[in-house]
Amino acid sequence: EICGPGIDIRNDYQQLKRLENCTVIEGYLHILLISKAEDYRSYRFPKLTVITEYLLLFRVAGLESLGDLFPNLTVIRGWKLFYNYALVIFEMTNLKDIGLYNLRNITRGAIRIEKNADLCYLSTVDWSLILDAVSNNYIVGNKPPKECGDLCPGTMEEKPMCEKTTINNEYNYRCWTTNRCQKMCPSTCGKRACTENNECCHPECLGSCSAPDNDTACVACRHYYYAGVCVPACPPNTYRFEGWRCVDRDFCANILSAESSDSEGFVIHDGECMQECPSGFIRNGSQSMYCIPCEGPCPKVCEEEKKTKTIDSVTSAQMLQGCTIFKGNLLINIRRGNNIASELENFMGLIEVVTGYVKIRHSHALVSLSFLKNLRLILGEEQLEGNYSFYVLDNQNLQQLWDWDHRNLTIKAGKMYFAFNPKLCVSEIYRMEEVTGTKGRQSKGDINTRNNGERASCESDVLHFTSTTTSKNRIIITWHRYRPPDYRDLISFTVYYKEAPFKNVTEYDGQDACGSNSWNMVDVDLPPNKDVEPGILLHGLKPWTQYAVYVKAVTLTMVENDHIRGAKSEILYIRTNASVPSIPLDVLSASNSSSQLIVKWNPPSLPNGNLSYYIVRWQRQPQDGYLYRHNYCSKDKIPIRKYADGTIDIEEVTENPKTEVCGGEKGPCCACPKTEAEKQAEKEEAEYRKVFENFLHNSIFVPRPE
């Protein structure tokens, strides 16, 4: 029986009975959060051979081995992974060995075995026989191998039963438990699986088989399973499903999505029966089974049950990620936040249509509304009291609505209201009236000319650049000295600059009122000599990189309650000069004959200009004697990450200082202090652990169903 779409067993160990008839779990298997130690010996699921996604075990008290539970689990396909892992064993307090003695293949993904204080028989398993690449495996904080004393079957009687392989230059016996060897197929089978009697399976088999060279006798399929046969590709009129089997259109039409809340079923696309259209495609109509390419970003309609969605934090904005049409009203109330403008753009930047009204109030963290960078239509189907569909009240730092030169926004129905936005110039509001087609709808009090823009220099003069000079990592610019009516009103200049691969940046990109700004800022004092033009040398720049630069005059903003003139430049785009490129990457050479070498490489990460050609140099080298000393017949494998010395709850394991030769002098001394690179690597490792643990907790702790 195929079970699925994913099985979550938690809290009560008797739920394991759900696995009774499963031969394949189509999806994931979670066994977790069983805090009462139970006797699992009566639970055995010999039918289970394949898990198509991943296996996750977390905090299951009393479980000492997986071998009795899943004696025939042969393949974990990893079609979908848990944070890049196909097998996760985390904080299993009583687990003594993994014991999955029939596990032969993890098709995709790595393994993560962490914080299992009693877990042994880890160094005796050769994961390279199960996974393609072991370099991403993470085996840390388990029982130290020194304390384990792992012995493979027959070793004590000096009649070892298991085969040997080399891991980390150690040639040793490979086993899962004290009485179960790790199965290895004869080398004659190559990459093929084999039977218990070491006969080679059919090439389409994966893991094992019950009869040799027979594509109907496979335990699991390398590619796809269809009508009892393992096939390299799905036959005509059938479709790939969940990475392992072929199904017909009827099946695909009737099946449900795992998290589905309505009958919108699967789609058929590119020979596959899949849950949703892939990126860049959309269903050809509601409930359709077929996908068509999107024109521009794919539409995604999001609806708010309570009609009005309040955006008061990044978390609430996150719910709108990917939405292009918002059915309802938006109330934006962002008082504070870190890097808020770019976070909001990330989550709300695709919204094109709001069917109701948009209200922005008390959003003191906002400098601009440009984070709604694709908003083109406010329908105003629902309006605020007074028939307002765009309402902007008391936003102390709001300076810009949108860049009206590059923005078409229509407000189909309803009026606009603006009050108490002290840094928002009335001219900006009037411009919005024209662009949105609302001119004439507003009554006199809807746009308050006294308390909008009262603390801004709204009548801006244009500063003109007079010269620009570039080198590979410097830009020198000068601009006309600005002369306001009263020279005492001019305090200084501020130069803003940033990398700009494209000429599409605006002054307010990534800027908020809480200190986040995608622009670098440099203050420039007035030159003491009135005839000298102000200027700046920007240094530490990247070669062959386009920068956007603009300058603002810093002026006193109020003179006896009159709005005074400010000044700023247009945005100038300027590219630094080219420089020497960094080294080419990933240089590989191989010989394809006795007189030829094929050399391949990737371009440098920093071309620092337009690459025109490469220079390849070579010279003959003397033969290295080491080549003759090394035994190339030994099955060397890529080493697994080093095991931890103890549980990783203790951040630093203090050991006795090693006695070793340090520096130039011979003689004992303390272990060399860690290099900056080592410290950084440790820091990243600790960070990586935290990120994974957060991901684990966020994924598995869910509210109880009502």
Partner: antibody, heavy 115, light 107 residues
Framework: EVQLVESGGGLVQPGGSLRLSCAAS????????IHWVRQAPGKGLEWVGE????????NYNENFKNRFTISADTSKNTAYLQMNSLRAEDTAVYYC????????WGQGTLVTVSS | DIQMTQSPSSLSASVGDRVTITCKAS??????VAWYQQKPGKAPKLLIY???YRYSGVPSRFSGSGSGTDFTLTISSLQPEDFATYYC?????????FGQGTKVEIK
């Protein structure tokens, strides 16, 4: 072979309650919607509602939402239709059907509401 | 709710005849229409889904067409076992709805 078997029908008095069962076999129960559809004697088909057995989410015909409740027990591969405050006009054959396109149906169970 | 109006409500035909049943939706339902056959005392059986896809095991004499609001079920050559009631069904919008049925009788 896919099989859906309804049970629990019978005679019930107006205002009474009844719980119908739909036992599924021959397929992965949690991978397909289960719908309930009824057919009054000599009349057409009327959709009652549906359940996603993998997460318990339901959708109902508004006409039945307050009186009828659909549930599922994945350990028994069975879906249920709990019917309360029954009326004479609820007399019908009740079918359960599988999948987004109702590709497999049970044989139906007759519910008679009469005093 | 979306109304599905079937016509005719009944028809008489002979074996070998070509029979066409139409179904009109009160609003656009895309291609999300299925057709079922029901014989007296039995459960309905799926014939056609997504307006035009024949369900497995259904004879090729049954075909469906249409999209939007107008749909057709055609039996190219009526067989004795085809005498039954046929229902159209929309699954585009909740609540799902059925046509009132078309009874195909022997002439």
């Amino acid at each position: 072979e896919v099989q859906l078997v309804e049970s629990g029908g019978g005679l019930v008095q107006p205002g009474g309650s009844l719980r119908l069962s739909c036992a599924a076999s021959g397929y992965t129960f949690t991978r397909f919607w289960i719908h309930w559809v009824r057919q009054a004697p000599g009349k057409g088909l009327e959709w009652v509602g549906e359940i996603n057995p993998s997460n318990g989410r339901t959708n109902y015909n508004e006409n039945f939402k307050n009186r009828f409740t659909i549930s599922a027990d994945t350990s028994k591969n069975t879906a249920y239709l709990q019917m309360n405050s029954l009326r004479a006009e609820d007399t019908a054959v009740y079918y359960c059907a599988r999948g987004g396109r109702l590709d497999q149906w049970g044989q139906g169970t007759l519910v008679t509401v009469s005093s | 709710d979306i109304q599905m109006t079937q016509s005719p409500s009944s028809l008489s035909a002979s074996v070998g005849d070509r029979v066409t049943i139409t179904c009109k939706a009160s609003q656009n339902v895309g291609s999300n229409v299925a057709w079922y056959q029901q014989k007296p005392g039995k459960a309905p059986k799926l014939l056609i889904y997504s307006a035009s896809y024949r369900y497995s095991g259904v004879p090729s004499r049954f075909s469906g067409s249409g999209s939007g609001t107008d749909f057709t079920l055609t039996i190219s050559s009526l067989q004795p076992e085809d005498f039954a009631t046929y229902y159209c069904h929309q699954y585009n919008n909740y609540p799902y709805t059925f046509g009132q049925g078309t009874k195909v009788e022997i002439k």
